[in-house]
Interface confidence: medium
Amino acid sequence: TQNKALPENVKYGIVLDAGSSHTSLYIYKWPAEKENDTGVVHQVEECRVKGPGISKFVQKVNEIGIYLTDCMERAREVIPRSQHQETPVYLGATAGMRLLRMESEELADRVLDVVERSLSNYPFDFQGARIITGQEEGAYGWITINYLLGKFSQKTRWFSIVPYETNNQETFGALDLGGASTQVTFVPQNQTIESPDNALQFRLYGKDYNVYTHSFLCYGKDQALWQKLAKDIQVASNEILRDPCFHPGYKKVVNVSDLYKTPCTKRFEMTLPFQQFEIQGIGNYQQCHQSILELFNTSYCPYSQCAFNGIFLPPLQGDFGAFSAFYFVMKFLNLTSEKVSQEKVTEMMKKFCAQPWEEIKTSYAGVKEKYLSEYCFSGTYILSLLLQGYHFTADSWEHIHFIGKIQGSDAGWTLGYMLNLTNMIPAEQPLSTPLSHSTYV
């Protein structure tokens, strides 16, 4: 007779990342008896929800249920039926919903309410939908990457998780770039965190961490682009905007109503005597970079040192993992290699932005034009943000590691969020034996 495999004693968790531009569903899995160990939780599935971010459903909330269906059905397939009722589901909304809430708490609540009702219809253990703070987003991203890198384990590891990993217990800083906000989180070296809003204290696995974090709302790549356009059209005072951040020959008509729809452009708002304007690309990295720098106010700083807009930033310390859009954009531009210096990145961006739009479309025929057209801006913005915004230098650039996944799990805030909400990161070091190597798939 054939041996029947013993049922796996595993647990699952689901986190939906409701970002400004889209929603993604992540399914995590871990051995039930090892849930307090570090490094045991791993991602088994990512499902990208078709369509925009949930904040865009404000005028059509009745469509939210259908919008979430495909990915929730996928979760139903991936997770064994016997586990459905024990599987927690969390939805965290980020900066897109923070912006909507700034405009109208009532509208934001209405969207979340419909999201909650839709998710409650599934056979999982729904734990709620909420807008997480920028501080949480930064903190959970930091927890995720350090958990996956094994930085919280006090035991000496006998294998290396990632090629750029250092074998010490120094944590990595986290750099997260979304569509509407960007977060910087790290442990400063013996530095007082001068601004209480930016200070976090954690005790994880028996060790204390004093962490600096800040989330810059409106400085995600999409909102930064809206800001730049709103700033530039003020000066252009014309129905045509020659824009160095788009490829030569690129043309696009923008509605002024769309430009001023977001709270991020309010500071640049003016009465324009036209309803639309046309962007005409001129593809010049240097000019694009200069234009982006005008979004960062570096003249005001009430602390010993600042990032921009008067926000305290301690001296950078150690290695950093740059993920989410930092990774996606740099991956597209083929600039994620550890060997590519900052000078080389700049040179390659100059060449890329100068390429004619028709040539770019031919070279990247499979990429949606909406995304393709914005890589010149996004790449230039990433350089501007890291160098002038966060004060990385040509030398410290080599401490930035563009990370998509670590051991098969996406770098981002969702894993850290779930670990926290399921109490899977103990304050004290658990008394358990090391995992066998085979546990890491």
Epitope: A236, N238, R242, N284, Q287, E294
Partner: antibody
């Protein structure tokens, strides 16, 4: 080759009117905003007026507001400056210049046409 | 209105000499500044835009720079055709305003 050629200048009595023209060639006129700038004898440059590519925006210097009107005919590639209630201090060489943010802000100028307001 | 204070109003220099002209803005103009050259016959030519970008066809001896609200035009080695009037122009807001001009003469 980009060319801007002003015409219509001359001698006018105070209180009189005159219309200046600027003929454009060598570029897509309908894409560009256009300016009038003047220079009084032995003085520096003074901005006078601006009109956007589609004529929806018009800006004027306080010194000419209510007296001067800027207009354009995109079909004929021509810019105009209608001047009324002229004063002696309007005596100057009048230049037209084209404008397109980011890289073509007042990048090409005409050679100028002279207006003299005198009794 | 934004005032552009240009200095010096005139300067005498010899061929091959290095000269610098400065414009100070009364309010933030964020690098929205052109440098123009006006020849004795009245012809006006833009040399620099966005504070530091050289126009195509303009000799490399011309350069523009910015330090806070001060903007400079430098000619590294004067040539005979450089003797002219120079103006700065801000285009950060309306009304557009010019500096008072600098006359560069042969010593």
């Amino acid at each position: 080759e980009v060319q801007l050629v002003e015409s219509g200048g001359g001698l006018v009595k105070p209180g009189g009117s005159l219309k200046l023209s600027c003929a454009a060639s060598g570029f897509t006129f309908s894409d560009y905003g256009m300016h009038w700038v003047r220079q009084a004898p032995e003085k520096g440059l003074e901005w006078v007026a601006y009109i956007s590519s589609g004529s929806s925006i018009r800006y004027y210097a306080d010194t000419v507001k209510g007296r001067f009107t800027i207009s354009r005919d995109n079909a004929k590639n021509t810019l105009f400056l209608q001047m009324t209630s002229l004063r002696s201090e309007d005596t100057a060489i009048y230049y037209c210049a084209r404008d397109l943010y980011y890289d073509h802000v007042l990048d090409y100028w005409g050679q100028g046409t002279t207006l003299t307001v005198s009794s | 209105d934004i005032q552009m204070t240009q200095s010096p109003s005139s300067l005498s220099a010899s061929l091959g000499e290095r000269v610098s002209l400065t414009c100070r803005a009364s309010q933030e103009v964020s690098g929205y500044l052109n440098w123009l050259q006006q020849k004795p016959d009245g012809t006006i030519k833009r040399l620099i835009y966005a504070a530091s970008t050289l126009d195509s066809g303009v000799p490399k001896r011309f350069s523009g720079s910015r330090s806070g609200s001060d903007y400079s035009l430098t000619i590294s080695s004067l040539e005979s055709e450089d003797f002219a009037d120079y103006y700065c122009l801000q285009y950060a807001s309306y009304p557009r305003t010019f500096g008072g001009g600098t006359k560069v003469e042969i010593k």
